[in-house]
Interface confidence: low
């Protein structure tokens, strides 16, 4: 679809005559008829297949024709067509004299024709005007012409329809050749496809308008490149949506069970070694000099009051040393050179002779302790409460306030498997991931400390100089009954060579 445009510029008819040679009276009132048709090698009469147009009277005899397009007038003349421009044409321009106001062909005398020109040729679509001048014996006509495409039609033949649009069918303007030029943010042959946010994941993201990135189900993030893990996944990730792959050290369906409490929480203090022992469970192995569930307590070896009979304890780098009072000797001042005759029991303690008077034992009244009943009972000094339990003095007795998860007189039992006190004979129960373990006291063995085993402290023949060895079953220690002429805990000193006591 397009328009053939003809611009009449000047018509010269100096003598004011008709084609017949007869003069016009009073002058030649001139108008034009134009016929546009398909290409003919010899232009002949017949239908104006591409269209016709007529002008009003434009002047008399000789005149210039004003360009009237800006004022909505009829110059240039418009011959619209609704087909593909073939590139060739035939054009007939007739100049007529109008004696009256009626310009219809049937209203004019046949000899009113002033001149007739016919041209034919090739004409490409374009904005440039072709200038032409046709001269006959009596007249001259100067004119120009061109073919342009109608609005929304493009291409060499005005056959390409393109109408700019910005709706859901497309977002484009038209180039001079009729090709689409997408508006910013749109792409595709018909500019229907929005250009998503730069970096938006090709498969997992999409957009309905430019610079947008909407995630498909199971994906998230600004660029839809992060998968959404299973709902409730705590310490896990995904490589595809709705997965929950646990991070190192986590277990359970939703990766919410801590299998590496040691690494995640570092509970052991003072350089202790931490061992994972199940879900949220751990064991601290303390360095020498430390104690407590988390090895948080500094241990003085004298704290357990190892020196008996009023001996004073001195901490040393590799342990401790007991300074014994007169009448006592041994590693813990446990051996006495005294007898009941020396009234060694304090605070109303009653004395009992042992080993035929070689030594004695004090039976202390309530609230007193020590080999000689010399100590008032502080039942908490030995840190009897296990697993971080807090020791509380209650007059003559004591009690342990346990941390959550522990129970028993000394907080020695985990609440779970150890709750039913499975260890016999005072065995200590330990909760393990897959059960429990009993630590048996001296003299007992078996999975639940149910087997009594006698410990013979004399088995190692600790007594010298043919002394008689006795096992004290209450303390699992030995006592040497020295023959005449020898003294000492092992009868190792001959009488007359007294031991060199440190005081």
């Amino acid at each position: 679809s397009g328009v053939f445009q003809l611009q009449l510029q000047e018509f010269i008819n100096e003598r004011g005559v008709l084609a017949s040679g007869r003069p016009c009276e009073p002058g030649c009132r001139t108008f034009f008829r134009v016929c546009l048709k398909h290409f003919q090698a010899v232009v002949s009469p017949g239908p104006c297949t591409f269209g016709t147009v007529s002008t009003p009277v434009l002047g008399t005899n000789s005149f210039a024709v004003r360009d009237d397009s800006s004022g909505g007038g009829r110059n240039p003349l418009q011959l619209p067509f609704n087909f593909t421009w073939p590139g060739t044409f035939s054009l007939i321009i007739e100049a007529w004299h109008a004696p009256g106001d009626d310009l219809r062909p049937e209203a004019l005398p046949p000899d009113a024709l002033i001149s007739k020109i016919a041209i034919q040729g090739s004409l490409a679509v374009g904005q440039n005007w072709l200038l032409d001048e046709q001269t006959s014996t009596l007249t001259r006509l100067r004119y120009s012409y061109r073919v342009i495409c109608s609005d929304n039609y493009y291409g060499d033949n005005c056959s390409r329809l393109c109408k700019k649009r910005n709706d859901h069918f497309g977002h484009y303007v038209c180039q001079p050749d009729g090709n689409l030029s997408c508006l910013p943010g749109w792409t595709g042959e018909y500019c229907q496809q929005p250009i998503c946010l730069s970096g938006c994941h090709e498969q997992n993201g999409y957009c309905s308008k430019p610079a947008e990135c909407l995630c498909r189900p199971g994906w998230q993030g600004r660029l839809c490149n992060e998968c959404i893990p299973h709902n409730g996944c705590r310490h896990g990730t995904c490589s595809t949506p709705w997965q929950c792959t646990c991070d190192e050290g986590w277990g359970g369906l939703f990766c919410d069970q801590d299998l590496n409490y040691c690494t995640h929480h570092s509970p052991c203090k003072n350089g202790a070694t931490c061992s994972n022992s199940g879900q949220r469970s751990y064991t601290c192995t303390c360095r020498p000099g430390y104690t407590g569930v988390d090895c948080e307590l500094e241990l003085s070896e004298c704290d357990s009051n190892p020196c008996r009979n009023g001996g004073s304890c001195k901490d040393q780098e590799d342990g401790y040393h007991c300074l014994c009072p007169p009448g006592y000797y041994g590693l813990h001042c446990e051996h006495s050179t005294l007898s009941c005759a020396d009234s060694p029991c304090f605070n109303g303690g009653s004395c009992r002779e042992r080993n035929q008077g070689a030594n004695y034992a004090c039976e202390c009244p309530p609230n007193f302790t020590g080999s000689n009943c010399e100590k008032k009972v502080d039942r908490c000094t030995s840190n009897p409460c296990a697993n971080g339990g807090q020791c509380l003095n209650r007059g003559p007795s004591r009690m342990c306030r346990c941390r959550p998860g522990f129970t028993g007189t000394y907080c020695e039992l985990h609440v779970s498997d150890c709750a039913r006190n499975p260890c016999a004979h005072g065995g200590t129960c330990h909760d393990l991931e897959n059960g429990l373990m009993c630590t048996c006291p001296a003299g007992f063995s078996g999975r639940r400390c149910e087997v009594r085993t006698s410990i013979d402290a004399c088995a190692s023949s600790p007594c010298f100089n043919r002394a008689t060895c006795y096992t004290d079953l209450s303390t699992d220690t030995f006592v040497c009954n020295c023959p005449y002429g020898f003294v000492g805990s092992r009868c190792e000193f001959p009488v007359g060579l007294p031991p060199s006591f440190p005081w």
Epitope: L161, G170, G188, E189, Y190, Q192
Partner: nanobody
């Protein structure tokens, strides 16, 4: 509101024929290409035929070429798909669609579909 309504589906024996119709409303029918695609259960959709706005350009998938014919009646705002020599593998839901442009490029609107079942 753009609407494409398919009809003419049904049960037919192998070797038989059906004629599907697609009645269009809600936009300028003359300006847009109309096509047909089908989707069998568990399979990807398959574009089978399309006709340009002018009716001058038609397209057929290899699987239906020579057996199916597409045509349009611009006066009735209707597109037809004549299906001959039907095979069991033609069983699917058939959808009428338009790209919203004159040429057969993409899909913008589709109908609800009509079931075609070819028994052996």
């Amino acid at each position: 509101e753009v609407q494409l309504v398919e009809s003419g589906g049904g049960l037919v024996q192998a070797g038989g024929s059906l004629r599907l119709s697609c009645a269009v409303s809600g936009f300028s029918f003359d300006d847009y290409a109309i096509g047909w695609f089908r989707q069998a259960p568990g399979k990807e959709p398959e574009g089978i035929s399309c006709i340009s706005s002018s009716g001058g350009i038609t397209y057929y998938a290899d699987s239906v070429k020579g057996r199916f014919t597409i045509s349009r009646d611009n006066a009735k705002n209707t597109v037809y798909l004549q299906m001959n020599s039907l095979k069991p593998e033609d069983t699917a839901v058939y959808y009428c669609a338009t790209p919203g442009i004159a040429a057969c490029r993409g899909i913008h609107y589709t109908g609800q579909g009509t079931q075609v079942t070819v028994s052996s």
